[in-house]
Interface confidence: medium
């Protein structure tokens, strides 16, 4: 697994550097998770032809993956910092069950999958410190998550591969959109 942000050789070699600001830390954390997703996507795409599949829409209908929309306040038109931050945190919390599903889906990148999951938890903590309106953040129901996880794990092999591909792709896109929005804050 890659070295977590703030622990790379450059940072170790340069202790005189100014500490990262909250925004820089969040930025770096997201980019670190995105690197992990890239590695997982590589394994998924090498293992199956899911990345070129045109049947994505069929499987996507069964998943309720978080996605940014105009109303979330994260786009330049109608940008709203607090609404957007709530959306990002809520979305990441909703992704957690899908990241849990990914844990047993990789052979050579098992450690990487764990790193993505743990780094996302850290990112959520960073963002919660930044948010003013924590009451507006809805946490997914654990019972609902547990039954969703069971349902996903009971799918046939093809659907499981497709689900893995879709989760990684959607999570990458959600994070990229978040990165884009957070840089406006």
């Amino acid at each position: 697994a890659p070295v977590p942000p703030g622990e790379d050789s450059k940072d170790v070699a340069a202790p005189h550097r100014q500490p990262l600001t909250s925004s820089e830390r969040i930025d770096k954390q997201i980019r670190y998770i995105l690197d992990g997703i890239s590695a997982l996507r590589k394994e998924t795409c090498n293992k199956s032809n899911m990345c070129e599949s045109s049947k994505e829409a069929l499987a996507e209908n069964n998943l309720n993956l978080p996605k940014m929309a105009e109303k979330d306040g994260c786009f330049q038109s109608g940008f709203n910092e607090e609404t957007c931050l709530v959306k990002i945190i809520t979305g990441l919390l909703e992704f957690e069950v899908y990241l849990e599903y990914l844990q047993n889906r990789f052979e050579s990148s098992e450690e990487q999958a764990r790193a993505v999951q743990m780094s996302t938890k850290v990112l959520i903590q960073f963002l919660q410190k930044k948010a003013k309106n924590l009451d507006a953040i809805t946490t997914p129901d654990p019972t609902t998550n547990a039954s969703l996880l069971t349902k996903l794990q009971a799918q046939n092999q093809w659907l499981q591969d497709m689900t893995t591909h879709l989760i990684l792709r959607s999570f990458k896109e959600f994070l990229q959109s978040s990165l884009r929005a957070l840089r406006q804050m």
């Epitope: 980019r31 940014m68 105009e70 994260c74 959109s177 884009r180």
Partner: antibody
Framework: EVQLVQSGGGLIQPGGSLRLSCAAS????????MIWVRQAPGKGLEWVSD????????YYADSVKGRFTMSRDISKNTVYLQMNSLRAEDTGVYYC??????????????WGRGTLVTVSS | DIVMTQSPSTLSASVGDRVTITCRAS??????LAWYQQKPGRAPKVLIY???TLESGVPSRFSGSGSGTDFTLTISSLQPEDFATYYC?????????FGQGTKLEIK
């Protein structure tokens, strides 16, 4: 081969409208950041707008916000820049370009050849 | 908005010279910086991104360094085809901003 073919420039009167087109080949716009950059005669480069593939959200420079609209037609693999209420200061070469899909350190890796827009009475 | 200030505006040099162009950001941009080369009547092309990563196909005489607010582009030994205008660009947050350009001309 990855390339961007631009069309739609020309001479237009102040207050007029123009639509620039940028047809992509060798890659799909539905999974790439796309961007418009302009260059006034003898001047430097200025970012105009960009469109993020994921949700189709667009960002605009303050100088064109409310007047220009960037859009895409995925079936034609083409992006557009609709320019309304044109002003003399909008004169220049407009470049359509692609951001390298590198979340870590993005940069513009493919450029169109540019299309000249002249706003004059 | 981030403002990128390039210096010098114009630079006269000879083939074989080592030249350095600097770019300063009005606020820290980490390594979110790219350098572009533009020849008259042509579209720009990327030379360096991530402050110091050479784009594939770009000659190794081009190099970039810096992070935070201060960045440099160095051409170790000028070739005739290097006479052009160079732009730095901050790719950190919209609005994406370019420096005003440095015109490199033959002495």
């Amino acid at each position: 081969e990855v390339q961007l073919v631009q069309s739609g420039g020309g001479l237009i009167q102040p207050g007029g409208s123009l639509r620039l087109s940028c047809a992509a080949s060798g890659f799909t716009i539905s999974s790439n950041y796309m961007i418009w950059v302009r260059q006034a005669p003898g001047k430097g480069l200025e970012w105009v707008s960009d469109l993020y593939y994921y949700a189709g959200d667009t960002y605009y420079a303050d100088s064109v916000k409310g007047r220009f609209t960037m859009s895409r037609d995925i079936s034609k693999n083409t992006v557009y820049l609709q320019m309304n209420s044109l002003r003399a200061e909008d004169t220049g070469v407009y470049y359509c370009a692609r951001w390298a899909d590198d979340h870590n350190y993005p940069h513009i890796d493919v450029w169109g050849r540019g299309t000249l827009v002249t706003v004059s009475s | 908005d981030i403002v990128m200030t390039q210096s010098p505006s114009t630079l006269s040099a000879s083939v074989g010279d080592r030249v350095t162009i600097t770019c300063r950001a009005s606020q820290g941009i980490s390594s979110w910086l790219a350098w572009y080369q533009q020849k008259p009547g042509r579209a720009p092309k990327v030379l360096i991104y991530k402050a110091s990563t050479l784009e594939s196909g770009v000659p190794s005489r081009f190099s970039g360094s810096g992070s935070g607010t201060d960045f440099t582009l160095t051409i170790s030994s000028l070739q005739p085809e290097d006479f052009a205008t160079y732009y730095c660009a901050a790719h950190y947050a919209a609005p994406w901003t370019f420096g005003q350009g440095t015109k490199l001309e033959i002495k």
